[in-house]
């Protein structure tokens, strides 16, 4: 005498479960459960989501919604897209900036903090790859700087300072005594 | 051995209130809807309320407003507070358990019923 | 609210006989492909007993002589043959949707 047998729904369409009393079809996306069916293979009373909560998928037993998340400041999130009754807010960072997640298995969910991104153009570099999910990846020193030590020097204009190796490979010019 | 016992029936003046409850015995209570059933003096069948596994009441509109179902599944007991009662509410409340292979609401086992009067 | 007549009120029936009993429902218990008619038999002093459900599904231990037909608004209970512990009133309930109703009773007496 368990009771644990759950009788299968035998109703048209596969969108339906036993709440309260009787095989009820579920709620819609962005909507929530009000009141169960009271007739078999009935339409429970669903409500929509009210402003700032959201329920993402069809669902038979949510009887509120979830609430949007808000963006943290703090890390310097913004809204990529504004929380709906069907989906949550996506935040992410704004442009220049990039996701610095704070553990080590990054998944979608995990938290973050948002970093500027490396300007190439300041550190006088080439910019090889844009920064969107990670940091800009900074390439070759521009026309009239070449390398020196971590950084960028830019071109002798005149011919009384020193021009080591590189710096007249790619200044194009030897200094001459 | 499925065993359902109503108690808390009596002499009540109209106007009054009443709790009555139902002990269960002998099965997974918590995974059953069940419901309060009255048989009036006449010998009619009237349903008077339910309570789903997963925590629904329903109430014919009648009865809304006066009659509250609440169960205790720690305890295995299944209560009906009944107020505001008048003349048409003496009848014998029996607490009734669903069948567990329906998806519908159909009554497998019985109480022996507890006897609610209503006169002044 | 679906309102259940039952017919006869009463019946006088003979030890091996058949006995016929009527529940007529007000507006349709059937949908889904399912009739949502049931059947209860009460002995006094006993409380109900579910004999069948879905109108022709037959309780678990109760005996092959009870029989249930019936579908949409008309439903039959037949006992054949009746047996001495047969006589008790019987009662249609239907679950087509909320409030739940029961028939007034059918009494069934043996000659």
């Known amino acids: 005498q368990g009771g644990t047998r759950s009788p299968r729904c035998d109703c048209a369409g596969d969108f339906h479960k036993k709440i309260g009393l009787f095989c009820c079809r579920g709620c819609p996306a962005g909507h929530y459960l009000k009141a169960p069916c009271t007739e078999p293979c009935g339409n429970s009373t669903c409500l929509v989501c009210p402003q700032d909560t959201f329920l993402a998928w069809e669902n038979h037993h949510n009887s509120e919604c979830a609430r949007c998340q808000a963006c943290d400041e703090q890390a310097s999130q913004v809204a990529l897209e504004n929380c709906s009754a069907v989906a949550d807010t996506r935040c992410g960072c704004k442009p220049g900036w990039f996701v610095e997640c704070q553990v080590s298995q990054c998944v979608s969910s995990s938290p973050f903090y948002c970093q500027p991104c490396l300007d190439c153009g300041a550190l006088h570099r080439h910019t090889r790859l844009l920064c969107s999910r990670r940091d800009t990846d900074c390439g070759t020193c521009l026309p009239g700087f070449y390398e020196h030590g971590d950084g960028c020097v830019s071109c002798p204009t005149s011919t009384l300072g020193s021009c080591p190796e590189r710096c007249a490979a790619v200044c194009g010019w030897r200094q001459m005594f | 051995e499925v065993k359902l016992v109503e108690s808390g029936g009596g002499l009540v003046k109209p106007g009054g209130s009443l709790k009555l409850s139902c002990s269960a015995s002998g099965f997974a209570f918590s995974n059953y809807d069940m419901s309060w059933v009255r048989q009036t003096p006449e010998k009619r069948l009237e349903w008077v309320a339910a309570f789903s596994s997963d925590g629904y009441t329903f109430y014919p509109d009648s009865l809304k407003g006066r009659f509250t179902i609440s169960r205790d599944n720690a305890r295995n007991t299944l209560y009906l507070q009944m107020s505001s009662l008048g003349s048409e509410d003496t009848a014998l409340y029996c607490c009734?358990?669903?069948?567990?292979?329906?998806?519908?609401?159909?009554?497998?086992?019985w109480g022996q019923g507890t006897s609610v009067t209503v006169s002044s | 609210d679906i309102v259940l007549a039952q017919s006869p009120a009463s019946l006088l029936v003979s030890l091996g006989q058949r006995a016929t009993i009527s529940c007529r429902a007000s507006?349709?218990?059937?949908?889904?492909?399912?009739?949502?008619m049931h059947w209860y038999q009460q002995k006094p002093g006993q409380p109900p007993k579910l004999l069948i459900y879905?109108?022709?599904n037959l309780e678990s231990g109760v005996p092959a002589r009870f029989s249930g037909s019936g579908s949409g608004t008309d439903f039959t209970l037949n006992i054949h043959p009746v047996e001495e512990e047969d006589a008790a009133t019987y009662y249609c309930?239907?679950?087509?949707?909320?409030?739940?109703?029961f028939g007034a009773g059918t009494m069934l007496e043996l000659k």
């Open positions: 879905l109108a022709s």
């Open positions: 507006k349709s218990v059937s949908t889904s492909g399912y009739s949502y």
């Open positions: 309930q239907h679950s087509r949707e909320l409030p739940l109703t």
């Open positions: 009734a358990r669903h069948a567990d292979y329906a998806n519908y609401p159909v009554m497998d086992y």
